[in-house]
Protein backbone atom coordinates (compact mmCIF):
# COMPACT_ATOMS: atom_id res chain seq x y z
CA UNK A 1 0.00 0.00 0.00
CA UNK A 2 1.33 3.42 -0.88
CA UNK A 3 1.03 5.79 2.06
CA UNK A 4 1.13 8.90 -0.15
CA UNK A 5 -2.34 8.16 -1.38
CA UNK A 6 -5.37 8.61 0.85
CA UNK A 7 -7.48 6.19 -1.19
CA UNK A 8 -6.91 2.96 0.72
CA UNK A 9 -9.22 0.08 0.11
CA UNK A 10 -11.98 -0.30 2.69
CA UNK A 11 -10.20 -3.37 4.04
CA UNK A 12 -7.76 -0.95 5.69
CA UNK A 13 -10.27 -0.47 8.50
CA UNK A 14 -12.38 -2.86 10.53
CA UNK A 15 -15.57 -1.31 11.85
CA UNK A 16 -17.94 -2.48 14.54
CA UNK A 17 -21.25 -0.96 15.54
CA UNK A 18 -22.38 -1.90 19.05
CA UNK A 19 -25.19 -1.07 21.39
CA UNK A 20 -23.30 -0.24 24.58
CA UNK A 21 -25.49 0.77 27.51
CA UNK A 22 -28.14 1.49 24.88
CA UNK A 23 -25.88 3.93 23.06
CA UNK A 24 -24.88 3.35 19.42
CA UNK A 25 -21.10 3.19 19.44
CA UNK A 26 -19.09 2.84 16.24
CA UNK A 27 -15.55 1.65 16.84
CA UNK A 28 -12.75 0.94 14.41
CA UNK A 29 -9.35 -0.69 14.11
CA UNK A 30 -6.70 -0.09 11.50
CA UNK A 31 -5.03 -2.91 9.63
CA UNK A 32 -1.44 -2.84 8.41
CA UNK A 33 -0.89 0.85 8.97
CA UNK A 34 2.71 1.62 9.71
CA UNK A 35 1.84 5.31 10.19
CA UNK A 36 -0.54 5.73 13.10
CA UNK A 37 -2.99 8.63 12.69
CA UNK A 38 -2.89 11.43 15.23
CA UNK A 39 -6.62 11.99 14.81
CA UNK A 40 -9.74 10.93 12.91
CA UNK A 41 -12.85 12.54 11.47
CA UNK A 42 -16.08 10.62 10.90
CA UNK A 43 -18.59 11.64 8.24
CA UNK A 44 -21.83 10.07 7.02
CA UNK A 45 -24.89 10.44 4.85
CA UNK A 46 -28.14 8.50 4.52
CA UNK A 47 -28.25 6.16 1.54
CA UNK A 48 -31.90 6.80 0.68
CA UNK A 49 -31.28 10.56 0.58
CA UNK A 50 -27.69 10.98 -0.54
CA UNK A 51 -26.49 14.46 0.28
CA UNK A 52 -23.07 15.87 1.05
CA UNK A 53 -21.30 13.93 3.75
CA UNK A 54 -22.01 15.37 7.18
CA UNK A 55 -19.23 15.61 9.76
CA UNK A 56 -20.17 14.08 13.12
CA UNK A 57 -19.49 17.01 15.45
CA UNK A 58 -18.24 15.04 18.46
CA UNK A 59 -16.08 12.87 16.17
CA UNK A 60 -14.28 15.58 14.22
CA UNK A 61 -10.52 15.63 14.81
CA UNK A 62 -10.93 13.03 17.53
CA UNK A 63 -8.04 11.01 18.93
CA UNK A 64 -10.40 8.22 20.05
CA UNK A 65 -11.03 5.15 17.91
CA UNK A 66 -14.75 5.16 18.59
CA UNK A 67 -17.68 7.50 18.11
CA UNK A 68 -21.06 7.78 19.85
CA UNK A 69 -23.66 8.05 17.10
CA UNK A 70 -26.81 7.72 19.21
CA UNK A 71 -28.01 11.23 18.43
CA UNK A 72 -27.08 10.98 14.74
CA UNK A 73 -28.25 7.55 13.66
CA UNK A 74 -31.90 7.45 14.70
CA UNK A 75 -33.26 4.82 12.30
CA UNK A 76 -32.78 1.07 12.35
CA UNK A 77 -34.17 0.85 8.81
CA UNK A 78 -31.92 3.29 6.98
CA UNK A 79 -28.44 2.54 5.70
CA UNK A 80 -25.80 5.01 6.78
CA UNK A 81 -22.94 5.57 4.35
CA UNK A 82 -19.97 6.18 6.63
CA UNK A 83 -16.52 7.58 5.87
CA UNK A 84 -13.63 7.55 8.32
CA UNK A 85 -10.67 9.79 7.57
CA UNK A 86 -7.33 9.34 9.31
CA UNK A 87 -4.87 12.21 9.62
CA UNK A 88 -1.32 12.82 10.73
CA UNK A 89 -1.12 16.52 11.42
CA UNK A 90 -2.63 18.15 8.32
CA UNK A 91 -1.95 15.17 6.05
CA UNK A 92 -4.77 12.76 5.18
CA UNK A 93 -3.37 9.26 5.61
CA UNK A 94 -6.39 7.27 4.52
CA UNK A 95 -10.12 7.20 4.05
CA UNK A 96 -12.27 4.13 4.69
CA UNK A 97 -15.97 3.78 3.96
CA UNK A 98 -18.70 1.35 4.87
CA UNK A 99 -22.50 1.16 4.87
CA UNK A 100 -24.22 0.36 8.16
CA UNK A 101 -27.73 -0.96 8.60
CA UNK A 102 -28.38 -1.00 12.33
CA UNK A 103 -31.13 -3.63 12.17
CA UNK A 104 -28.66 -6.24 10.95
CA UNK A 105 -25.16 -4.91 11.71
CA UNK A 106 -25.60 -4.01 15.37
CA UNK A 107 -24.00 -6.18 18.04
CA UNK A 108 -25.30 -5.98 21.59
CA UNK A 109 -22.96 -5.57 24.52
CA UNK A 110 -24.06 -6.92 27.88
CA UNK A 111 -25.47 -4.53 30.46
CA UNK A 112 -23.66 -3.82 33.72
CA UNK A 113 -24.85 -5.89 36.67
CA UNK A 114 -24.12 -6.75 40.29
CA UNK A 115 -24.88 -9.87 42.30
CA UNK A 116 -25.53 -10.39 45.99
CA UNK A 117 -25.56 -13.93 47.39
CA UNK A 118 -27.88 -15.06 50.19
CA UNK A 119 -28.25 -18.49 51.76
CA UNK A 120 -30.38 -20.00 49.01
CA UNK A 121 -30.82 -17.29 46.40
CA UNK A 122 -28.94 -14.63 44.45
CA UNK A 123 -30.16 -11.13 43.70
CA UNK A 124 -29.05 -10.02 40.23
CA UNK A 125 -29.26 -6.25 39.77
CA UNK A 126 -29.08 -5.29 36.08
CA UNK A 127 -28.32 -1.65 35.32
CA UNK A 128 -30.13 -0.12 32.37
CA UNK A 129 -29.99 3.59 31.52
CA UNK A 130 -32.87 5.64 32.91
CA UNK A 131 -34.00 6.68 29.43
CA UNK A 132 -33.60 4.62 26.27
CA UNK A 133 -34.30 6.06 22.82
CA UNK A 134 -37.35 4.37 21.31
CA UNK A 135 -35.41 3.71 18.09
CA UNK A 136 -32.77 1.78 20.05
CA UNK A 137 -35.11 -0.62 21.83
CA UNK A 138 -34.65 -3.31 19.13
CA UNK A 139 -36.30 -6.61 19.98
CA UNK A 140 -34.04 -7.68 22.80
CA UNK A 141 -34.35 -10.32 25.50
CA UNK A 142 -32.34 -10.21 28.70
CA UNK A 143 -30.71 -13.54 29.49
CA UNK A 144 -29.20 -14.38 32.88
CA UNK A 145 -27.06 -17.49 33.02
CA UNK A 146 -26.45 -19.27 36.30
CA UNK A 147 -23.53 -21.70 36.49
CA UNK A 148 -22.65 -24.11 39.24
CA UNK A 149 -20.55 -27.26 39.22
CA UNK A 150 -20.58 -27.47 35.43
CA UNK A 151 -24.33 -27.02 35.10
CA UNK A 152 -25.61 -23.97 33.22
CA UNK A 153 -29.18 -22.72 33.62
CA UNK A 154 -30.68 -19.97 31.46
CA UNK A 155 -33.15 -17.50 32.91
CA UNK A 156 -35.15 -15.21 30.62
CA UNK A 157 -36.86 -12.69 32.87
CA UNK A 158 -39.89 -10.95 31.47
CA UNK A 159 -39.32 -7.22 31.58
CA UNK A 160 -42.47 -5.15 31.62
CA UNK A 161 -42.23 -2.15 29.33
CA UNK A 162 -38.85 -1.22 27.91
CA UNK A 163 -35.37 -1.87 29.25
CA UNK A 164 -34.80 1.25 31.30
CA UNK A 165 -33.95 1.87 34.94
CA UNK A 166 -32.54 -0.79 37.24
CA UNK A 167 -33.99 -4.30 37.16
CA UNK A 168 -33.65 -6.94 39.86
CA UNK A 169 -34.06 -10.65 39.27
CA UNK A 170 -33.94 -13.34 41.95
CA UNK A 171 -32.38 -16.70 41.16
CA UNK A 172 -33.89 -18.88 43.84
CA UNK A 173 -33.92 -22.52 45.03
CA UNK A 174 -30.14 -22.54 45.30
CA UNK A 175 -27.99 -24.75 47.49
CA UNK A 176 -26.30 -23.08 50.49
CA UNK A 177 -22.53 -23.25 50.84
CA UNK A 178 -22.17 -23.60 47.06
CA UNK A 179 -20.30 -21.47 44.54
CA UNK A 180 -22.46 -19.90 41.82
CA UNK A 181 -21.40 -17.79 38.86
CA UNK A 182 -23.65 -15.45 36.89
CA UNK A 183 -23.37 -13.96 33.41
CA UNK A 184 -25.82 -11.66 31.65
CA UNK A 185 -26.32 -10.77 28.00
CA UNK A 186 -28.79 -9.37 25.51
CA UNK A 187 -30.21 -11.70 22.89
CA UNK A 188 -31.50 -10.22 19.65
CA UNK A 189 -32.30 -13.32 17.64
CA UNK A 190 -31.40 -16.97 17.92
CA UNK A 191 -28.98 -16.69 15.05
CA UNK A 192 -26.86 -13.81 16.24
CA UNK A 193 -23.64 -14.32 18.14
CA UNK A 194 -24.17 -13.02 21.67
CA UNK A 195 -21.64 -11.11 23.76
CA UNK A 196 -21.73 -12.51 27.27
CA UNK A 197 -20.58 -10.53 30.26
CA UNK A 198 -17.65 -11.82 32.29
CA UNK A 199 -18.79 -14.15 35.06
CA UNK A 200 -19.42 -12.78 38.54
CA UNK A 201 -19.22 -15.43 41.22
CA UNK A 202 -20.30 -15.77 44.82
CA UNK A 203 -20.06 -18.50 47.45
CA UNK A 204 -23.43 -18.71 49.15
CA UNK A 205 -23.25 -18.69 52.94
CA UNK A 206 -23.99 -21.96 54.70
CA UNK A 207 -27.61 -22.51 55.73
CA UNK A 208 -28.88 -23.34 59.23
CA UNK A 209 -29.07 -27.07 58.47
CA UNK A 210 -25.52 -27.33 57.21
CA UNK A 211 -24.31 -25.33 60.25
CA UNK A 212 -26.00 -27.71 62.69
CA UNK A 213 -24.70 -30.66 60.69
CA UNK A 214 -21.18 -29.26 60.92
CA UNK A 215 -21.41 -28.79 64.71
CA UNK A 216 -22.77 -32.33 65.11
CA UNK A 217 -19.58 -33.65 63.53
Amino acid sequence: ISYDSPDYTDESCTFKISLRNFRSILSWELKNHSIVPTHYTLLYTIMSKPEDLKVVKNCANTTRSFCDLTDEWRSTHEAYVTVLEGFSGNTTLFSCSHNFWLAIDMSFEPPEFEIVGFTNHINVMVKFPSIVEEELQFDLSLVIEEQSEGIVKKHKPEIKGNMSGNFTYIIDKLIPNTNYCVSVYLEHSDEQAVIKSPLKCTLLPPGQESESAESAK
Epitope: R74, H77, E78, A79, S107, E191
Partner: antibody, heavy 117, light 112 residues
Framework: QVQLQQSGPELVRPGVSVKISCKGS????????IHWVRQSHAQSLEWIGV????????NYNQKFKGKATMTVDKSSSTAYMELARLTSEDSAIYYC??????????WGQGTSVTVSS | DVVMTQTPLTLSVTIGQPASISCKSS???????????LNWLLQRPGQSPKRLIY???KLDSGVPDRFTGSGSGTDFTLKISRVEAEDLGVYYC?????????FGGGTKLEIK
Protein backbone atom coordinates in the same frame (compact mmCIF):
# COMPACT_ATOMS: atom_id res chain seq x y z
CA GLN B 1 -23.05 -2.69 -13.15
CA VAL B 2 -24.56 -4.38 -10.12
CA GLN B 3 -25.09 -8.11 -10.60
CA LEU B 4 -26.18 -10.95 -8.36
CA GLN B 5 -25.32 -14.19 -10.13
CA GLN B 6 -27.05 -17.27 -8.73
CA SER B 7 -26.10 -20.92 -9.16
CA GLY B 8 -27.91 -23.14 -11.64
CA PRO B 9 -31.11 -25.19 -11.30
CA GLU B 10 -31.22 -28.13 -8.88
CA LEU B 11 -33.18 -31.35 -9.21
CA VAL B 12 -32.96 -33.25 -5.93
CA ARG B 13 -34.50 -36.18 -4.10
CA PRO B 14 -36.72 -35.71 -1.04
CA GLY B 15 -34.87 -35.73 2.28
CA VAL B 16 -31.56 -34.40 0.99
CA SER B 17 -30.05 -30.91 1.31
CA VAL B 18 -29.07 -28.41 -1.34
CA LYS B 19 -26.80 -25.35 -1.18
CA ILE B 20 -27.37 -22.50 -3.59
CA SER B 21 -25.08 -19.54 -4.13
CA CYS B 22 -25.32 -15.86 -4.99
CA LYS B 23 -22.22 -14.00 -6.15
CA GLY B 24 -22.26 -10.20 -5.98
CA SER B 25 -20.29 -8.03 -8.40
CA UNK B 26 -20.20 -4.42 -9.56
CA UNK B 27 -20.40 -3.04 -6.02
CA UNK B 28 -18.75 -3.37 -2.60
CA UNK B 29 -20.19 -6.69 -1.47
CA UNK B 30 -19.85 -6.07 2.28
CA UNK B 31 -21.77 -2.78 2.05
CA UNK B 32 -25.05 -4.57 1.39
CA UNK B 33 -26.93 -7.32 3.18
CA ILE B 34 -28.15 -10.33 1.21
CA HIS B 35 -31.74 -11.51 1.50
CA TRP B 36 -33.27 -14.76 0.28
CA VAL B 37 -36.82 -14.92 -1.06
CA ARG B 38 -38.84 -17.96 -2.15
CA GLN B 39 -41.35 -17.89 -4.96
CA SER B 40 -43.70 -20.82 -5.25
CA HIS B 41 -47.00 -21.14 -7.10
CA ALA B 42 -48.91 -21.52 -3.85
CA GLN B 43 -47.35 -18.73 -1.80
CA SER B 44 -46.29 -15.94 -4.18
CA LEU B 45 -43.15 -14.32 -2.61
CA GLU B 46 -41.93 -15.27 0.86
CA TRP B 47 -39.02 -13.64 2.66
CA ILE B 48 -36.73 -16.34 4.09
CA GLY B 49 -34.18 -14.15 5.85
CA VAL B 50 -31.25 -11.77 5.64
CA UNK B 51 -27.55 -12.03 6.38
CA UNK B 52 -25.23 -9.09 7.03
CA UNK B 53 -22.31 -9.66 4.69
CA UNK B 54 -20.01 -7.61 6.92
CA UNK B 55 -21.20 -8.56 10.40
CA UNK B 56 -22.39 -12.09 9.63
CA UNK B 57 -25.53 -11.38 11.68
CA UNK B 58 -28.65 -13.14 10.46
CA ASN B 59 -32.37 -12.70 10.84
CA TYR B 60 -34.64 -15.56 9.77
CA ASN B 61 -38.33 -15.73 9.14
CA GLN B 62 -39.50 -18.15 11.90
CA LYS B 63 -41.18 -20.25 9.21
CA PHE B 64 -37.79 -21.11 7.69
CA LYS B 65 -35.79 -21.70 10.86
CA GLY B 66 -34.34 -25.19 10.69
CA LYS B 67 -35.05 -25.31 6.96
CA ALA B 68 -32.71 -22.60 5.65
CA THR B 69 -29.17 -21.72 6.73
CA MET B 70 -27.57 -18.57 5.34
CA THR B 71 -23.80 -18.09 5.20
CA VAL B 72 -21.43 -15.70 3.49
CA ASP B 73 -17.88 -15.87 2.13
CA LYS B 74 -16.53 -12.33 2.01
CA SER B 75 -13.36 -13.35 0.16
CA SER B 76 -15.35 -14.50 -2.87
CA SER B 77 -18.24 -12.01 -2.47
CA THR B 78 -20.64 -14.92 -2.32
CA ALA B 79 -23.65 -15.64 -0.14
CA TYR B 80 -25.00 -19.16 0.29
CA MET B 81 -28.25 -20.66 1.44
CA GLU B 82 -28.54 -24.31 2.39
CA LEU B 83 -31.98 -25.90 2.42
CA ALA B 84 -32.27 -29.03 4.56
CA ARG B 85 -34.53 -32.09 4.50
CA LEU B 86 -36.19 -31.12 1.26
CA THR B 87 -39.78 -32.05 0.50
CA SER B 88 -41.95 -31.41 -2.55
CA GLU B 89 -43.26 -28.28 -0.78
CA ASP B 90 -39.77 -26.77 -1.07
CA SER B 91 -39.93 -26.86 -4.87
CA ALA B 92 -39.74 -23.21 -5.88
CA ILE B 93 -37.58 -20.50 -7.35
CA TYR B 94 -35.20 -19.03 -4.77
CA TYR B 95 -33.98 -15.48 -5.26
CA CYS B 96 -31.21 -13.59 -3.56
CA UNK B 97 -31.51 -9.83 -3.39
CA UNK B 98 -29.38 -7.12 -1.84
CA UNK B 99 -30.35 -4.28 0.46
CA UNK B 100 -28.77 -1.47 2.37
CA UNK B 101 -31.57 -0.99 4.83
CA UNK B 102 -35.27 -1.35 4.22
CA UNK B 103 -35.57 -2.15 0.51
CA UNK B 104 -34.42 -4.79 -1.96
CA UNK B 105 -32.93 -2.83 -4.84
CA UNK B 106 -31.32 -5.58 -6.97
CA TRP B 107 -32.34 -9.21 -7.39
CA GLY B 108 -30.54 -12.28 -8.70
CA GLN B 109 -31.93 -14.23 -11.64
CA GLY B 110 -33.28 -16.96 -9.37
CA THR B 111 -32.39 -20.61 -8.77
CA SER B 112 -35.01 -23.23 -9.51
CA VAL B 113 -35.12 -26.08 -6.98
CA THR B 114 -37.23 -29.10 -7.89
CA VAL B 115 -37.72 -31.85 -5.32
CA SER B 116 -38.82 -35.09 -6.91
CA SER B 117 -38.35 -38.79 -6.33
CA ASP C 1 -46.43 -11.18 10.92
CA VAL C 2 -47.68 -8.18 8.94
CA VAL C 3 -50.22 -9.28 6.33
CA MET C 4 -50.13 -7.42 3.02
CA THR C 5 -53.40 -7.58 1.04
CA GLN C 6 -53.45 -6.56 -2.61
CA THR C 7 -56.47 -5.92 -4.81
CA PRO C 8 -57.44 -6.69 -7.47
CA LEU C 9 -55.92 -10.09 -8.19
CA THR C 10 -56.02 -9.43 -11.94
CA LEU C 11 -56.31 -6.17 -13.85
CA SER C 12 -57.14 -6.06 -17.57
CA VAL C 13 -56.32 -2.69 -19.07
CA THR C 14 -56.29 -1.24 -22.57
CA ILE C 15 -53.00 0.32 -23.63
CA GLY C 16 -53.07 4.07 -22.98
CA GLN C 17 -55.62 3.72 -20.17
CA PRO C 18 -54.89 4.23 -16.46
CA ALA C 19 -54.52 1.44 -13.90
CA SER C 20 -54.66 1.38 -10.11
CA ILE C 21 -53.59 -1.26 -7.58
CA SER C 22 -54.41 -1.18 -3.87
CA CYS C 23 -52.28 -2.57 -1.04
CA LYS C 24 -53.31 -2.70 2.61
CA SER C 25 -51.11 -3.72 5.54
CA SER C 26 -52.36 -5.24 8.79
CA UNK C 27 -50.08 -2.92 10.80
CA UNK C 28 -48.88 0.63 10.25
CA UNK C 29 -45.70 0.91 8.19
CA UNK C 30 -44.98 4.39 9.53
CA UNK C 31 -41.87 4.34 11.68
CA UNK C 32 -40.83 6.63 14.53
CA UNK C 33 -38.22 8.07 12.14
CA UNK C 34 -41.09 9.57 10.12
CA UNK C 35 -40.64 7.30 7.10
CA UNK C 36 -43.08 4.70 5.79
CA UNK C 37 -41.41 1.50 4.64
CA LEU C 38 -43.64 0.38 1.76
CA ASN C 39 -42.19 -0.72 -1.58
CA TRP C 40 -43.51 -1.90 -4.95
CA LEU C 41 -41.91 -4.25 -7.44
CA LEU C 42 -42.75 -5.57 -10.88
CA GLN C 43 -42.06 -9.08 -12.09
CA ARG C 44 -42.33 -9.33 -15.85
CA PRO C 45 -43.08 -12.77 -17.34
CA GLY C 46 -40.06 -15.07 -17.06
CA GLN C 47 -37.94 -12.46 -15.26
CA SER C 48 -36.77 -11.82 -11.72
CA PRO C 49 -38.46 -9.07 -9.70
CA LYS C 50 -37.41 -5.45 -10.20
CA ARG C 51 -37.95 -2.66 -7.69
CA LEU C 52 -40.18 0.15 -8.94
CA ILE C 53 -40.94 2.28 -5.89
CA TYR C 54 -39.57 2.59 -2.35
CA UNK C 55 -40.62 4.67 0.67
CA UNK C 56 -44.20 4.76 -0.71
CA UNK C 57 -43.55 7.19 -3.56
CA LYS C 58 -39.87 7.35 -4.56
CA LEU C 59 -39.30 6.02 -8.08
CA ASP C 60 -36.30 3.81 -8.76
CA SER C 61 -33.89 5.14 -11.37
CA GLY C 62 -35.08 4.30 -14.86
CA VAL C 63 -38.72 3.93 -13.82
CA PRO C 64 -40.96 6.11 -16.02
CA ASP C 65 -42.90 8.89 -14.32
CA ARG C 66 -46.22 7.43 -15.44
CA PHE C 67 -45.87 5.34 -12.26
CA THR C 68 -46.85 6.99 -8.98
CA GLY C 69 -47.04 5.58 -5.48
CA SER C 70 -49.13 7.10 -2.71
CA GLY C 71 -50.68 6.34 0.67
CA SER C 72 -49.82 6.34 4.33
CA GLY C 73 -50.06 4.21 7.46
CA THR C 74 -51.78 1.06 6.24
CA ASP C 75 -53.37 2.03 2.87
CA PHE C 76 -51.30 2.39 -0.29
CA THR C 77 -51.90 2.72 -4.02
CA LEU C 78 -49.82 2.24 -7.14
CA LYS C 79 -51.11 4.10 -10.21
CA ILE C 80 -50.07 3.95 -13.83
CA SER C 81 -51.32 7.01 -15.70
CA ARG C 82 -51.18 5.41 -19.18
CA VAL C 83 -50.45 1.70 -19.42
CA GLU C 84 -47.89 0.59 -22.00
CA ALA C 85 -47.19 -2.93 -23.31
CA GLU C 86 -43.96 -3.20 -21.28
CA ASP C 87 -45.94 -2.73 -18.06
CA LEU C 88 -47.51 -6.17 -18.13
CA GLY C 89 -46.50 -8.56 -15.39
CA VAL C 90 -47.22 -9.09 -11.71
CA TYR C 91 -46.99 -6.18 -9.29
CA TYR C 92 -46.19 -6.82 -5.61
CA CYS C 93 -46.21 -4.49 -2.66
CA UNK C 94 -43.99 -5.35 0.29
CA UNK C 95 -43.05 -3.94 3.64
CA UNK C 96 -39.56 -3.50 5.08
CA UNK C 97 -40.49 -2.15 8.51
CA UNK C 98 -41.20 -5.29 10.53
CA UNK C 99 -39.26 -8.56 10.43
CA UNK C 100 -40.14 -10.85 8.78
CA UNK C 101 -40.55 -8.72 5.68
CA UNK C 102 -43.77 -9.64 3.92
CA PHE C 103 -45.16 -9.36 0.40
CA GLY C 104 -48.63 -8.89 -0.99
CA GLY C 105 -50.16 -11.72 -3.03
CA GLY C 106 -49.53 -9.89 -6.30
CA THR C 107 -51.70 -8.22 -8.94
CA LYS C 108 -51.42 -9.48 -12.50
CA LEU C 109 -51.66 -6.70 -15.06
CA GLU C 110 -52.93 -7.98 -18.40
CA ILE C 111 -53.24 -6.03 -21.61
CA LYS C 112 -56.74 -6.15 -23.13
Amino acid sequence: QVQLQQSGPELVRPGVSVKISCKGSGYTFTDYAIHWVRQSHAQSLEWIGVIGTYSGNRNYNQKFKGKATMTVDKSSSTAYMELARLTSEDSAIYYCARSAGYSLDFWGQGTSVTVSS
Amino acid sequence: DVVMTQTPLTLSVTIGQPASISCKSSQSLLDSDGKTYLNWLLQRPGQSPKRLIYLVSKLDSGVPDRFTGSGSGTDFTLKISRVEAEDLGVYYCWQGKHFPWTFGGGTKLEIK
